[in-house]
Amino acid sequence: QPVGINTSTTCCYRFINKKIPKQRLESYRRTTSSHCPREAVIFKTKLDKEICADPTQKWVQDFMKHLDKKTQTPKL
């Protein structure tokens, strides 16, 4: 689960053990801070909650790609 180191850094020490429905997720960010023991993905849900997920899991990678596509600006 994410642990706040300071106002700008959140570390994940435990990952959610179930797949979250794709449509519930609004955005994500990666934790790459040197303060954190391991890399993680933190999804933000539509109810404005944070969920820690394991970036090595396929569903997490797929959902990141899905969110990337959603946020890409259309090319003219």
Epitope: Q1, V3, R14, K18, P21, L47, K49, I51
Partner: antibody
């Protein structure tokens, strides 16, 4: 394994303020990704969600109770608390604390504490 | 707020029976629904999340289905230890809403 335990007075007088505390053991309350909730159950009735607090201090309260409730967190004691002001007999209930892991499912609950509002 | 209506409010069934409980939402909640079991004098226990997914450690005789506004909770072969009250809970919106509960008794 995270466990939750409610504590507080079992009897409160009308118009007074009810204060309950939930102690978290087996894990740190300041770990993010955990949302710490209060839920109550009137005698013989269903469940009513009261509100939650996040480790950052962010809260969300049920609008039906918002004017009377405060949920706070004390990371040094690994506790979070509920205060409910101006209580009436309608606030008589079993009060539960519960955790959700950001996924909106209450997967860990305290055993509940019965609070009676009576003079 | 979203209203959750469970039916029936109580039911009596025999060991081995297939038991079905329904939950209806006052608006579309996709599959954002959980089911809980509450035994007398105990706290509720999460059984099913996202309408149809079994929580870890929950026996496979429990199942859930549905989407939108209509949901079903099923116990395939009722066991004596299943005597409890069952609640649905939506999480499409805040505040979260629970159904009023279905009390299950053994004949």
């Amino acid at each position: 394994q995270v466990q939750l335990q409610e504590s507080g007075p079992g009897l409160v007088k009308p118009s007074q303020t009810l204060s309950l505390t939930c102690t978290v053991s087996g894990g740190s309350i300041s770990s993010g990704g955990n949302y710490w909730n209060w839920i109550r159950q009137h005698p013989g009735k269903g469940l009513e969600w009261i509100g939650y607090i996040y480790y950052s201090g962010n809260t969300y309260y049920n609008p039906s109770l918002k004017s009377r409730i405060t949920i706070s967190i004390d990371t040094s004691k690994n506790q979070f608390s509920l205060t409910l002001s101006s209580v009436t007999a309608a606030d008589t209930a079993v009060y539960y604390c519960a955790r959700d892991g950001g996924d909106d499912a209450f997967d860990i609950w305290g055993q509940g504490t019965m609070v009676t509002v009576s003079s | 707020d979203i209203q959750m209506t469970q039916s029936p409010s109580s039911l009596s069934a025999s060991v081995g029976d297939r038991v079905t409980i329904t939950c209806q939402a006052s608006q579309d909640i996709s599959n954002y629904l959980n089911w809980y079991q509450q035994k007398p004098g105990k706290a509720p226990k999460l059984l099913i999340y996202d309408a149809s997914n079994l929580e870890t450690g929950v026996p496979s005789r429990f199942s859930g289905s549905g989407s939108g506004t209509d949901f079903t909770f099923t116990i395939n072969s009722l066991q004596p230890e299943d005597i409890a009250t069952y609640y649905c809970q939506e999480y499409n919106n805040l505040p979260y809403s629970f159904g009023q509960g279905t009390k299950l008794e053994i004949k």
